[in-house]
Every structure is written in C-alpha cells, then in structure tokens.
Amino acid sequence: LKGQEFAPSHQQVYAPLRADGDKPRAHLTVVRQTPTQHFKNQFPALHWEHELGLAFTKNRMNYTNKFLLIPESGDYFIYSQVTFRGMTSECSEIRQAGRPNKPDSITVVITKVTDSYPEPTQLLMGTKSVCEVGSNWFQPIYLGAMFSLQEGDKLMVNVSDISLVDYTKEDKTFFGAFLL
Amino acid sequence: LKGQEFAPSHQQVYAPLRADGDKPRAHLTVVRQTPTQHFKNQFPALHWEHELGLAFTKNRMNYTNKFLLIPESGDYFIYSQVTFRGMTSECSEIRQAGRPNKPDSITVVITKVTDSYPEPTQLLMGTKSVCEVGSNWFQPIYLGAMFSLQEGDKLMVNVSDISLVDYTKEDKTFFGAFLL
Amino acid sequence: LKGQEFAPSHQQVYAPLRADGDKPRAHLTVVRQTPTQHFKNQFPALHWEHELGLAFTKNRMNYTNKFLLIPESGDYFIYSQVTFRGMTSECSEIRQAGRPNKPDSITVVITKVTDSYPEPTQLLMGTKSVCEVGSNWFQPIYLGAMFSLQEGDKLMVNVSDISLVDYTKEDKTFFGAFLL
C-alpha cells in the first residue's frame, strides 16, 4: 500500500500531516516606545520591531499595531523577555512611622485578545518586587509557555511601567510565538 | 488519489515533510571550567558536557570547543540557564561621598558566530545588577527564544564572570537548542 | 512515484511521520495547595489544575496525583514558573558577631521519577537567595529545557517552601510539557 511507510507503528488515526517549515512563527524585538496615553489602571502594551535585525514574522503570522495575529488554530509556544532598568527604588529607605513602604514592582503580562470575548485573557505574568539598594538597577523577566489559540486571536505584551523598559538592544527585550 | 490523507485542508504547497525524531537537538550541561586567561573586555565562553548525565547531542547537532554547530538551516529554539553564585557584593556598603557605587552585575549572552560574517551576533542577553546584602548570594538567569539559523552557524554562551558560574549541578546551568 | 513529494531532498531514512496535533501536551496551572506532611529534607511537590481555565492535557498526556505521566518516549520540552511571595527576609539584619546570616532561599526543581529507577532525577533547578529589605517581596523563577523521556516517566515540580508559592493566579505559577 502506498504511504504505508508514513504510518506510525501503533496505527492511530492522525490529523493531516504538515511540514514544519510552513508553520506560523514570529520573533519580535524591542524598539523605543513612542509616548502614548494609557489608562491609570491598565498596563500599557509594548510595540515591537518585526522585520529588522533578528526580528521576523513568517507563514501568515502577522504583526500589527502592538499585536501578533494568530493565523491558524493550534497549540503555540509563546515567550517574552523584558529587561527593566531604573534608578534606586526608595522602598527600603523611606519609612512611614517605622513601617517599610509597599515595594515598587515590575510586571510583564502576555495577554490574549479574542474579538468575540469582551475581556482580554492574561496568559502569562511575571512580577517582581524591586527594592534595590545600589544606585541603579537592571534585571530581566522571562516568560514562556504553551497555549491553545484560535485563528484570529491577538497577542500582546503589557508592562507595569513603559519608562523602565530597556529598549537599547534587540537581545534584551523580545517577544515571540510559534505553532507547535 | 494516494497520499491524499496527508494533504492539509486548505491545500497549501508545503516544504517536504520530515519526521520530528530526526531533527537536530542538543542539551548541554555545566562542567567545571578550566582555568584559562581571557581578554579583559571580552566575555568568556563556557564549555559544556555533551554526553554524560542529562546531556546529549543528536541528529548531526555536534558540540565542539565551546560551540554548538548547526547542521541544517531552519528555525531553532535556543535556551540557556546560568546559575551564578558569589560572596557578598559590596556595592551597597562602599559609598563614595554618600553615593552608592555602580552595582556589580551578572550577564549571560547567547552568541551566534557565522564564519562568513566578521562579527559575532548577540542573539539573547540576560543581565542583572547584583547588590546583595546577605553573606552569600545565588541566582539564575534564564534565556530562550527562536531564531532562524543557517547551516554552519555556531552557538556559544558567554558570561560576564566565569568564576561566578555555579558548576556544581547539571540541572542548575545548561544550554540547549532544537530545530522546530 | 506516489509519496515522492514527502521525501526530503537529502534522502535520509526517517522515522515514521506523525501529525503535530496528536502529540502529548500539557499546561497545568496553580491551585491552592492542601496542607500535607512532607519530610524535613525533601522538597514538597505542588499539585495542579489540569482542565479549568488555561490548563489542559491532551493526546494521552495525563495528570494524576501531582505527576504528569509521559505516554510515549521521545524528546520533550518541559517548563515551569513558580512565583514566590513572602514577608521581609531578615537575613541581612540579624548578624551574629558581625557575621551575616546564611541567606534565605527559594528553589524550584522539576523532577523525573522512573519506576524502574530507585532515585528521582532532578532535571531542572532554579534557586535564588532571598535577602530583601522591603516590607514584602515577590518574584518568579522560570525554568525550561528539553529532555529525552521514556514512556511511563513521571514529572513533578518541587519547591523549597510550599507556603511561599503564589497560588492566586493561573498566569503566575504553571507547569507544562510537550513532545517535540
């Protein structure tokens, strides 16, 4: 029988085969953020480089207006690193009535937006208190996991404070996804 | 028509199919670094275990002389974790005219070397200020992302200070890559 | 010849092809941990949500009693993030005869259990000293790498202190694996 050599030994019925090279994939890299207004209680979304340097999108995975657009349903591995940097956080030095302040923090959220669903879904969150005693500090937050996404879903990266994001190098702050 | 069951429903033309099990893959684990001199302003490269314990290379992905050699062009997921450890960083204690020192830092870079290209390319960087006040400190930096690589490319992991790398356990410090 | 379009150009012999969509995969999310006794020198294992919200298991990858069960041999990418949070660690403040205390620490270990092997194998470890000076602190540890697993292997996530794990949100603390 033709095609028999492709059949796995335990004779399960499989979904259609497809070549790996044509799967939707993207790796986006940091750019300097343009000043934009955002609501007080809403983390702003980062925008990204999608074609220069190390950045690319391929096989119908498109980047537009801070969003990665998911072109086909399936399980995706999604990842991001955001490097933050700032001057001393005063949380340990300024004490009110002898009580340490609530610490400053840095947060990254990878968010999914589905047009048919009113609320965005937080897929991944990395959050860290920052209470540094040196003069200036810098540190990355890395996230990555697998999610079942639907065609038309949109992904974005939100941060707690856009002004603390290190936009200086494409290898320090990035965002990517690929169909498994 | 024979083979029709392999054709995806939206009838796109695909690259040749290939079995996942034969794709180039490697997971390398930490070994104690041999004492070698390195240039002051250049981050030294780590060398790795490639066959004992959890470490392996397969399907033409080879490790030689601190480098992972990419045997075929394609999109690879590349990752590394380096655990650093050290005795107290003095940055918070030594103050000049009341001003905290520039903090110490730890940095990991995953670097690509292409023979036809004069300069190495930094693919991923994780960098963190270290200003610890306890007696000894330890912490990991994790990196991972997808890149389009060419046959013959070489990958290495560079660190800011080789003496701070925790080489004691294969699960603490590692480096890997696999073709998607 | 029928099926020729599936043959890769370098004419290697491949293992049987199989569709990506049927590969074993799981993404588990945090739940509040039930108080259980564990041995003093053994890190307790977390238990997980496997079907509500973002969590899922598919294609014979099953979750049972804190373990992910590996249904077929192959190379898997395994990942986890654990977000820890706690009140001030005093390690930098209490000094005995001018000597800083041993720092507190937080540790995540992804462990493999093979029934035919007496000892569990630590696949991945993320460990960090915690010596915070603010009033309360929080931070994630992320791990991810590729391992060759055998059918019947079991995976779990162990932590140094279960009471410090942030169980409040499914995007903060999670555990997953997928066959490559």
Epitope: - | V31, R32, Q33, T34, P35, T36, Q37, H38, E49, L52, R85, G86, M87, S89, S135, N136, D161, I162, S163, L164, T168 | R99, P100
Partner: antibody, heavy 119, light 111 residues
Framework: QVQLVQSGAEVKKPGASVKVSCKAS????????INWVRQAPGQGLEWMGW????????GYAQKFQGRVTMTADRSTSTAYMELSSLRSEDTAVYYC????????????WGQGTLVTVSS | QSVLTQPPSVSGAPGQRVTISCTSS?????????VHWYQQLPGTAPKLLIE???NRPSGVPDRFSGSKSGTSASLTITGLLPEDEGDYYC??????????FGGGTKLTVLG
C-alpha cells in the same frame, strides 16, 4: 569515614616522571573533585590543579600546564597525579585533597607523598 | 598575577586572642567562593578551619572564627592554646578559578 590514602615516598632523577596515587574511601568517589597541592621543604602550599573523577575533566594551574596529568580509576576509587620532566625544584610533599562542592574548599586531605628529585 | 598576602608570623600568650589577616591584590579574589583558612600543625597535612569567610566545619572549635572587610579576610583565634602552634594559610580563587594560597603565617604560642 572519609579517607584519602596516598602512595609512598619516591626518589626520582631529573628529567624523569613520577606518578602519585590517592585512594579514596568512605564516600562516593565520583561525586567530589580531587585537587592536588604541593609543599616544598620549608615553603608554603602551592595548588597544582583539580580532577573530576566522574567525567575525567581536569583543570591545571598555568605553571604546571603541559607537565602534569591527573587521572582517575573509578573501579578502584583512585586518583593519580603524574608530573613529568622533573627538576630539583619539584622536590616537595604532594597532597591530594577532596573539595566541598559548594565552596571549593579542601575539606579532606591525604597524608602526603614526599617526592625527592636528585641526581 | 593575583596574590594573597599574609603576615609571616604572629604570636600570643596562652589565653590571648590573635588575628591573622589575608589581603588580596585583586577585587575578584573571593568574589565567587570566599576565602578559606587552613591549619597545618608540624609534620601533618593541612586541615580546613574556615570555609567561605565565616563557616566552621563540624569539629572545629568555636575559638576559631573568620571575618571579611573589603578585600581582606581575617582569622581570629581566641583563648589561644599551646596546641594551636603551627602554620595558617588562607586560600581563595581568582577570576579564572585557579586556586591561590597565601604565603602562610607561623603562629607561635609564647611561654
């Protein structure tokens, strides 16, 4: 209990080689690095290098590179240090020492082997 | 080449307190693994007294303590005993993970 027992004293001629052994007992030999340290008569301690008995990996002090070889026989839990092209200034007591993995301090020491280089 | 410098000799009467210093010529000495201290009594192999600046292995009396300040480490012996007489060495690692020993300090217990 942990013990490191070294081979006996040796007398060698200049230009020759010497191989000193260090037999370990009381612990899992492959789990700890072994270091070699020497001490010339009336002098201080001088580090020569380390050996990982599990992998066979080594790291040598720059001064001894090309002249020293450290090896292990896992079946007998024995570490070896061979020094070639001996000269009179290599006359010393040679110690093997087991490391603490976390700090790389030398926790357990052999009794020492006197190597005399004389024509 | 990095160097660890110790005083060639120190002395004290029984019951007294002595301190031996170990100063590094480079800031990267001890940054990773700290400074360790060894005691070598006449005719014997060295013995680990202090690891990582401060920590006493089990069996080492609490008369021995270690400390650190800037690029220096110190070993302090309180309640000196005649059997403490011998040589004391500090040891650390440089930036290439090569081990370094100080030149050693001869401790004499007077009287």
């Amino acid at each position: 209990q942990v013990q490191l027992v070294q081979s006996g004293a040796e007398v060698k001629k200049p230009g020759a080689s010497v191989k000193v052994s260090c037999k370990a007992s009381g612990y899992t030999f492959t789990s700890y690095d072994i270091n070699w340290v020497r001490q010339a008569p009336g002098q201080g301690l001088e580090w020569m290098g380390w050996l990982n008995p599990n992998s066979g990996n080594t790291g040598y002090a720059q001064k001894f590179q090309g002249r020293v070889t450290m090896t292990a026989d896992r079946s007998t839990s024995t570490a070896y240090m061979e020094l070639s092209s001996l000269r009179s200034e290599d006359t010393a007591v040679y110690y093997c020492a087991r490391e603490v993995p976390e700090t790389a301090a030398f926790e357990y020491w052999g009794q020492g082997t006197l190597v005399t280089v004389s024509s | 080449q990095s160097v660890l410098t110790q005083p060639p000799s120190v002395s004290g009467a029984p019951g007294q307190r002595v301190t031996i210093s170990c100063t590094s010529s480079s800031s990267d000495i001890g940054a990773a693994l700290g400074v360790h201290w060894y005691q070598q009594l006449p005719g014997t192999a060295p013995k680990l007294l202090i690891e990582g600046y401060y920590n006493r292995p089990s069996g080492v009396p609490d008369r021995f303590s270690g400390s650190k300040s800037g690029t220096s480490a110190s070993l302090t012996i309180t309640g000196l005993l005649p059997e403490d007489e011998g040589d004391y060495y500090c040891q650390s690692y440089d930036g290439t993970l090569s081990a370094l020993f100080g030149g050693g300090t001869k401790l004499t217990v007077l009287g």
